[in-house]
């Protein structure tokens, strides 16, 4: 069941989710100059059976000046050789998340993919907040949220979550103080996606490294 | 108690706009998201989209993708769905419901028709 | 898109009867949710989550399944039931009801 509303915005926090629910959806979005080709699907879908869960349908962005060009969302395995190596970095996150049943992992990146992402959560989803960089965590609880519901209607619980104005971010769950990145900015910020559902994900491709940088942007 | 009102109705030329407008009252504007659904005479419901008054974020059933415009004005309390570019096809009831689930709250209903 | 058949489309009844509505969808489903609309007037909320009847609603309906099929029963039907009745899933995008099922006087 769709989560008919926002996980909450806590001042100077931004969110992501370590794993996503089977029936969690991601809008098929193109950068500016392309668009979702027109047989495409409008969303991926997070499916699955007993043992297994994945993305179902694959998120393709054609020009919108070239009428047959089409950008396939996920690589072919002979191209994922090629790709490897560039792709290792912005995809960092992959690589500590835990496989849950029922859960999908962070979808890949697909060519000229919008620069934000939105997520349509599911029941039963829990999104973890940080506080951003130069802001400091205090904790009175778990700073998560899940999304319930109750009498048909769905709403987010209150994550136990401050942050003040220090210099030292705080961390996910599970993770390890960052190292210092090579353009300064530590691992968390650079290589880990925050996710969301109607807030808006702006990306930025760092100069000096071919990783994605999400922060969230409030509306 | 939660109200939803719409609009009145409204009789369109083929190829004109209209916007209907849902002025929401008794609830938190912003706390819930508004949907709108159409009902074509003599036929079934079909979901349209849905604005988040909050962020003005607004996801649409492709079908009504290049048909319809929500938006919401925050000082108001009130929802608006445009439509353009009417044809006769587009002759239908439109209903505003009040989301965050299930939809609890439904307005009247405001009759659009499309003739020449 | 989810595909939501439900059956009969109509379905003529007495006062006093026992009537079941069948929703099937497409794809799996969490839940299924059903409205009531009377002629003239906006739906409403009458079962939701399956099995939940909303505020003010009489005990004498009820609602079953899971998967892909749903059922909305009515145990003896009353004059002020004779509506029609949608089911509902809001389980993916695009949301998607039924066709409708009209619940005539015999």
């Known amino acids: 069941e769709l989560c008919d509303d926002d996980p909450p915005k806590i001042t100077h926090a931004t969110f992501k989710a370590v794993a996503y629910k089977e029936g969690t959806m991601l809008n098929c979005e193109c950068k500016r100059g392309f668009r979702r080709i027109k047989s495409g699907s409008p969303y991926m879908l997070c499916t699955g059976n007993s043992s297994h869960s994945s993305w179902d349908n694959q998120c393709q962005c054609t020009s919108s000046a070239a009428r047959n060009t089409t950008k396939q969302v996920t690589p072919q395995p002979e191209e994922q050789k090629e790709r490897k190596t560039t792709e290792m970095q912005s995809q960092m996150q992959l690589a500590d998340q835990v496989s849950l049943p029922g859960h999908c992992r962070e979808p890949p990146p697909w060519e000229n993919e919008a620069t934000e992402r939105i997520y349509h959560f599911v029941v039963g989803q829990t999104v973890y907040y940080q506080c951003v960089q130069g802001y400091r965590a205090l904790h009175r609880g778990p700073a998560e949220s899940v999304c319930k519901m109750t009498h048909g209607k769905t709403r987010w619980t209150q994550p136990q979550l401050i942050c003040t104005g220090e210099t030292e971010p705080s961390q996910f769950p599970g993770e390890e103080e960052p190292q210092a990145s090579p353009d300064g900015l530590p691992e968390s910020e650079t290589s880990r996606l925050v996710t969301t559902t109607d807030f808006r994900i702006q990306t930025e491709v760092a100069a000096t490294m071919e990783t994605f940088i999400f922060t969230t942007e409030y509306q | 108690q939660v109200q939803l009102v719409q609009s009145g109705a409204e009789v369109k030329k083929p190829g004109s706009s209209v916007k209907v407008s849902c002025k929401a009252s008794?609830?938190?504007?912003?706390?819930?998201?508004m949907h709108w659904v159409r009902q074509a005479p003599g036929q079934g419901l079909e979901w349209m989209g849905y604005?988040?008054?909050?962020?003005?974020?607004?996801e649409y059933n492709q079908k009504f993708k290049d048909k319809a415009t929500i938006t919401a004005d925050e000082s108001t309390n009130t929802a608006y769905m445009e439509l353009s570019s009417l044809r006769s096809e587009d002759t239908a009831v439109y209903y505003c419901?009040?989301?965050?689930?299930?939809?609890?709250?439904w307005g009247q209903g405001t009759l659009v028709t499309v003739s020449s | 898109d989810i595909q939501m058949t439900q059956s009969p489309s109509t379905l003529s009844a007495s006062v006093g009867d026992r009537v079941t509505i069948t929703c099937s969808a497409s794809?799996?489903?969490?839940?299924m949710h059903w409205y009531q609309q009377k002629p003239g007037k906006a739906p409403k909320l009458l079962i939701y989550?399956?099995?939940d009847l909303a505020s003010g609603v009489p005990a004498r309906f009820s609602g079953s399944g899971s998967g892909t099929e749903f059922t909305l029963t009515i145990s003896s039907l009353q004059p002020d039931d004779f509506a029609t009745y949608y089911c509902?899933?809001?389980?993916?995008?695009?949301?998607?009801f039924g066709q409708g099922t009209k619940v005539e006087v015999k």
């Open positions: 509902h899933q809001r389980s993916t995008y695009p949301l998607t």
């Open positions: 419901a009040r989301g965050g689930g299930v939809f609890d709250y």
């Open positions: 794809s799996k489903i969490s839940y």
């Open positions: 604005i988040n008054p909050s962020s003005g974020y607004t």
């Open positions: 989550t399956t099995s």
């Open positions: 008794g609830y938190t504007f912003t706390s819930y998201r």
